[in-house]
C-alpha cells in the first residue's frame, strides 16, 4: 500500500485551509460543509464543543463562549501590548495565568480556561479530520504555516498546538514562502529572484519580500497591518447598510446584536460576490422588528466605502521595499495571498503601483498558502510523482457558455446544446475611457445576469493602449475541443496582445439535475430577468460613473490640471446623483439612464478637456459604440452593438 500522504495546513487568524499533494497535484480539501476554508473558531456550549463553520454560525447567540483570533495570542505573554490591545475588542474573556494568556469560557455548565495552543490545536484537529475524511485513512504528518514575522516562541507554540492535535509537525514554514512554493517560484532556474508576497486575509495584512536563489528562501523584509483585512471591509458595508436601514425604515439596528450579526454575514457574502460581479444583492428576511431588508450594492460603492483602507495597503509595500533596500523595479514576482486580494480594486492598486506588472493570482488566493504547504509536505515525505491533467469529457455543451459584460450581463458565445468541438468569436470593447484592461469572466448558465449563473474562471487582458471607451476592439474566442476542454482567448486587435484561460475540470460545475433545473427556471424567469437586468445595468452604470468621476477629479495627479470651479461642478453633480441614488434604489431604468446622461453632460466636457492633446477623447469621441450602460468600475468589458 502507498504510504500515507502528509498534509499542508494554513492555520489562519480567521480561516484555515488544508491541502494534500497526491497523484501529482495538490488538492485543497473541502470540509463537511463543502467549504474549502474553515473558520478558525471554537465554540463552547452547555452541551458540546463546536469547531469551524458550526462555531462561527452560532457566534451571535453565544459570543462570550465563541473563541477566535487565537493566532493573535499564541506564543505571546499576557502583558504583551498586542494582547492587551486586542483583548478590548473580544467578546470572550482572556485571563492571566503566570503571564500567559488563557481564554476563559463556560463549557457544559463549568468555567474552563484554555491556552491559545489548545484552541489552535482544536482548529488543527478539525483540519486533520477534514483531510482524513477525504483521504480515507489517518493522517499524522503535516507542514504548518506561520507569518514570516512570528518569533521563535510563536513558532514553537504553533508546533505545540500541532502536537496536541496529534500531528507530527514536519516543519513550520513561513506563509509567504509557502505561497512562493505554490507558484513554483523556487523552480524557475533563473538565478536570484526577488518576490513580493501581498497577503490580505480576513483580519491581517502582511507584506513580505523574499529572495529565492537555488531553492533557498531568505526573508528580506516584512511589513503590514495586524488589524487590516476582510473583516474591516465587512464593517464598512455593515455601517453603510445600518445607515441605509435608518434612512429607509427610520430604525437603528446597530444595538441589536443578532440583527447586526445577520447583516454582517450577508455583507461578507456580498463582498465576495463583488469580486466577480459589479453588483451584489442582500436579502435578509425579518432583519429587525419584522422588517425584511432587501437591498443591493455596486462594486463602485463598495470601493468608495473602503477606498482609504484599500489605499493604505500600499504603505506597507513601500515600507517593505525600503527595508529590503529594493526599488519596485527590482521585484521579479508579485504574489497575491488571502481572500481579500480577490478584490479587483486591491489588485488594480497593487498592479498600478508596480507599473502594470502581472500578478501571480492563478491559484485561489485563500488557498495558495495551504497549497504551498502541501507541496512542501510532499517534498519532505520524498514524493517524486509526475503531474496529472484533469480532463472534462462532453459531447455537447450542457449549458450556454459566455462572459460577463457591463452591468453583470451574461453574453453567451456558445449556446446550450452546441455539439463539440466548437469555436465562436465575438468582438467586445471597453466601457471606460482609457481603460487599461478588461476582465474576462467566463460563466455557464441560461440566466440573463451572471450572478444567477456559474462562474468557471476569469482572467485579465491588460495593456490596452489609452483610447476612448468603445474604441478598442477585443476579440474573444471560446473554443471547446473534442475532450470538452474550454479555451477562452482575448486579443486586443490593435496590439495583438492576448491572454487566455483553459477550463479543464468539472470542479464547481453543475450536475445533470442542476442543469435541467436551471434551464427550466431560466425560461420562467426570462422576461422578468430582462427588465431587472436592464434596470440593474442602468443603476450600475450611474453609480459607477458617479463614483469614478468623483475619484477622477479628487485624484492628486490632477492638481493644477483642473480648475477649482470645474472640480466643484463635477463634485456637486456627483454628490447630487449619489444622494439621489441612495434615496431611489428602486427607480426605473429610464430614471437611472437620465441621471447618468445628465451627469455625463456635466463631466464629459470637463474630463475630456484634461486629455485633449494627450490622445484622449474630445467631444463626440465615443464613436458609434458610445456609452451604453453597465459598470465602469474595474476593467469592465462591453459588448459591441
Amino acid at each position: 500500500m502507498a504510504k500515507a500522504a502528509a498534509i499542508g495546513i494554513d492555520l489562519g487568524t480567521t480561516y484555515s485551509c488544508v491541502g494534500v499533494f497526491q497523484h501529482g497535484k495538490v488538492e485543497i480539501i473541502a470540509n463537511d460543509q463543502g467549504n474549502r476554508t474553515t473558520p478558525s473558531y471554537v465554540a463552547f456550549t452547555d452541551t458540546e464543543r463546536l469547531i469551524g463553520d458550526a462555531a462561527k454560525n452560532q457566534v451571535a447567540l453565544n459570543p462570550q463562549n465563541t473563541v477566535f483570533d487565537a493566532k493573535r495570542l499564541i506564543g505571546r505573554k499576557f502583558g504583551d501590548p498586542v494582547v492587551q490591545s486586542d483583548m478590548k475588542h473580544w467578546p470572550f474573556q482572556v485571563i492571566n495565568d503566570g503571564d500567559k494568556p488563557k481564554v476563559q469560557v463556560s463549557y457544559k455548565g463549568e468555567t474552563k480556561a484554555f491556552y491559545p495552543e489548545e484552541i489552535s490545536s482544536m482548529v488543527l484537529t478539525k483540519m486533520k479530520e477534514i483531510a482524513e475524511a477525504y483521504l480515507g485513512y489517518p493522517v499524522t504528518n503535516a507542514v504548518i504555516t506561520v507569518p514570516a514575522y512570528f518569533n521563535d516562541s510563536q513558532r514553537q507554540a504553533t508546533k505545540d498546538a500541532g502536537v496536541i492535535a496529534g500531528l507530527n509537525v514536519l516543519r513550520i514554514i513561513n506563509e509567504p514562502t509557502a505561497a512562493a512554493i505554490a507558484y513554483g517560484l523556487d523552480r524557475t532556474g533563473k538565478g536570484e529572484r526577488n518576490v513580493l508576497i501581498f497577503d490580505l486575509g480576513g483580519g491581517t495584512f502582511d507584506v513580505s519580500i523574499l529572495t529565492i536563489d537555488d531553492g533557498i528562501f531568505e526573508v528580506k523584509a516584512t511589513a503590514g497591518d495586524t488589524h487590516l483585512g476582510g473583516e474591516d471591509f465587512d464593517n464598512r458595508l455593515v455601517n453603510h447598510f445600518v445607515e441605509e436601514f435608518k434612512r429607509k425604515h427610520k430604525k437603528d439596528i446597530s444595538q441589536n446584536k443578532r440583527a447586526v450579526r445577520r447583516l454582517r454575514t450577508a455583507c461578507e457574502r456580498a463582498k465576495r460576490t463583488l469580486s466577480s460581479s459589479t453588483q451584489a444583492s442582500l436579502e435578509i428576511d425579518s432583519l429587525f422588528e419584522g422588517i425584511d431588508f432587501y437591498t443591493s450594492i455596486t462594486r463602485a460603492r463598495f470601493e468608495e466605502l473602503c477606498s482609504d483602507l484599500f489605499r493604505s495597503t500600499l504603505e506597507p509595500v513601500e515600507k517593505a521595499l525600503r527595508d529590503a533596500k529594493l526599488d519596485k523595479a527590482q521585484i521579479h514576482d508579485l504574489v497575491l495571498v488571502g481572500g481579500s486580494t480577490r478584490i479587483p480594486k486591491v489588485q488594480k492598486l497593487l498592479q498600478d503601483f508596480f507599473n502594470g506588472r502581472d500578478l501571480n493570482k492563478s491559484i485561489n488566493p485563500d488557498e495558495a498558502v495551504a497549497y504551498g504547504a502541501a507541496v512542501q509536505a510532499a517534498i519532505l515525505m520524498g514524493d517524486k510523482s509526475e503531474n496529472v491533467q484533469d480532463l472534462l469529457l462532453l459531447d455537447v455543451a450542457p449549458l450556454s457558455l459566455g462572459l460577463e459584460t457591463a452591468g453583470g450581463v451574461m453574453t453567451a458565445l456558445i449556446k446550450r446544446n452546441s455539439t463539440i468541438p466548437t469555436k465562436q468569436t465575438q468582438i467586445f470593447t471597453t466601457y471606460s475611457d482609457n481603460q487599461p484592461g478588461v476582465l474576462i469572466q467566463v460563466y455557464e448558465g441560461e440566466r440573463a445576469m451572471t450572478k444567477d449563473n456559474n462562474l468557471l474562471g476569469r482572467f485579465e487582458l491588460s495593456g490596452i493602449p489609452p483610447a476612448p471607451r468603445g474604441v478598442p476592439q477585443i476579440e474573444v474566442t471560446f473554443d471547446i475541443d473534442a475532450n470538452g476542454i474550454l479555451n477562452v482567448t482575448a486579443t486586443d486587435k490593435s496590439t495583438g496582445k492576448a491572454n487566455k484561460i483553459t477550463i479543464t475540470n468539472d470542479k464547481g460545475r453543475l450536475s445533470k439535475e442542476e442543469i435541467e433545473r436551471m434551464v427550466q427556471e431560466a425560461e420562467k424567469y426570462k422576461a422578468e430577468d430582462e427588465v431587472q437586468r436592464e434596470r440593474v445595468s442602468a443603476k450600475n452604470a450611474l453609480e459607477s460613473y458617479a463614483f469614478n468621476m468623483k475619484s477622477a477629479v479628487e485624484d492628486e495627479g490632477l492638481k493644477g490640471k483642473i480648475s477649482e470651479a470645474d472640480k466643484k461642478k463635477v463634485l456637486d453633480k456627483c454628490q447630487e446623483v449619489i444622494s439621489w441614488l441612495d434615496a431611489n434604489t428602486l427607480a426605473e431604468k429610464d430614471e437611472f439612464e437620465h441621471k447618468r446622461k445628465e451627469l455625463e453632460q456635466v463631466c464629459n466636457p470637463i474630463i475630456s478637456g484634461l486629455y485633449q492633446g494627450a490622445g484622449g477623447p474630445g467631444p463626440g469621441g465615443f464613436g458609434a459604440q458610445g456609452p451604453k450602460g453597465g459598470s465602469g468600475s474595474g476593467p469592465t468589458i462591453e459588448e459591441v452593438d
Partner: antibody, heavy 116, light 112 residues
Framework: QIQLVQSGAEVKKPGASVKVSCKAS????????MNWVRQAPGQGLEWMGW????????TYADDFKGRFTFTTDTSTSTAYMDLRSLRSDDTAVYFC?????????WGQGTLVTVSS | EIVLTQSPDSLAVSLGERATINCKSS????????????LAWYQQKPGQSPKLLIY???TRESGVPDRFSGSGSGTDFTLTIDSLQAEDVAVYYC????????FGGGTKVEIK
C-alpha cells in the same frame, strides 16, 4: 450673447414628417444638454425629452417615445427634433431649451401645423 | 412619474398686491445630500418663449426682480409676486428636475 434660433413654421399633412432645427451660439454647444418642450394651442408646457450634446444620447419622456428622434450636429452647434407619421394632435409650438440644472435659455419656438 | 399640480388655475390680483401660486408634487423633490429641492419656476408671457425665474426652489435667476420669490420644501412649493406689476401678466409654470422633468399645468395671472 447666448442665443437659440429655431427653424421657421411648418405646415404638414397627416402621415408626413417634419424636422425642426435649433442652432445654438454664444457658448460651447457640447457643454450643455438640449431639451425639447411642446406646447399645444392654448395648453401648458410638456417636456418631451432632451439630448446629451456631448455623447449624442437622447432621452424621451414616455409620451414621446416612438415617433420622435432627437439628434445633434456638433460641427454646426445645431440640435434637431424629427417627428414622423404626423397626426393632427401634433399641432403645437415646439421649443428647444438649453439645460444646466434648469432651462436657462429658450429658442423662439417653431409652430408645426398638421392639417389635411 | 412625478406629477406637479398647480393651484389655482388662474388668479386675478390688483396692481401692487401680492400674488401667490402653489405647486404640489406627488413625491418629495428634496435631495438629502445636496439639501436642495429640485423645483424651478418659469414665466411665459403671451406669444413668447418661457423664461426662467427661480431654480432650486428659491434661487432667483440673474436679472429677475426681487419681487419674485420662491419657497417650500419636499412636496409643497410657492411662488410669490410681492407687488404685482402690469408686466407680470403671464402664465407661470413650476417644473421639477428631481427625476426626469415634468411641468405643472400652469397658473394664469391677470390684473384685477
Amino acid at each position: 450673447q447666448i442665443q437659440l434660433v429655431q427653424s421657421g413654421a411648418e405646415v404638414k399633412k397627416p402621415g408626413a414628417s417634419v424636422k425642426v432645427s435649433c442652432k445654438a451660439s454664444g457658448y460651447t454647444f457640447t457643454n450643455y444638454g438640449m431639451n425639447w418642450v411642446r406646447q399645444a394651442p392654448g395648453q401648458g408646457l410638456e417636456w418631451m425629452g432632451w439630448i446629451n450634446t456631448y455623447t449624442g444620447e437622447p432621452t424621451y419622456a414616455d409620451d414621446f417615445k416612438g415617433r420622435f428622434t432627437f439628434t445633434t450636429d456638433t460641427s454646426t452647434s445645431t440640435a434637431y427634433m424629427d417627428l414622423r407619421s404626423l397626426r393632427s394632435d401634433d399641432t403645437a409650438v415646439y421649443f428647444c431649451a438649453r439645460y444646466d440644472h434648469y432651462m436657462d435659455y429658450w429658442g423662439q419656438g417653431t409652430l408645426v401645423t398638421v392639417s389635411s | 412619474e412625478i406629477v406637479l399640480t398647480q393651484s389655482p388655475d388662474s388668479l386675478a390680483v390688483s396692481l401692487g398686491e401680492r400674488a401667490t401660486i402653489n405647486c404640489k408634487s406627488s413625491q418629495s423633490l428634496l435631495n438629502s445630500g445636496t439639501r436642495k429641492n429640485y423645483l424651478a419656476w418659469y414665466q411665459q408671457k403671451p406669444g413668447q418663449s418661457p423664461k426662467l425665474l427661480i431654480y432650486w426652489t428659491s434661487t432667483r435667476e440673474s436679472g429677475v426682480p426681487d419681487r419674485f420669490s420662491g419657497s417650500g420644501s419636499g412636496t409643497d412649493f410657492t411662488l410669490t409676486i410681492d407687488s404685482l406689476q402690469a408686466e407680470d401678466v403671464a402664465v407661470y409654470y413650476c417644473k421639477q428636475s428631481y427625476t426626469l422633468y415634468t411641468f405643472g399645468g400652469g397658473t394664469k395671472v391677470e390684473i384685477k
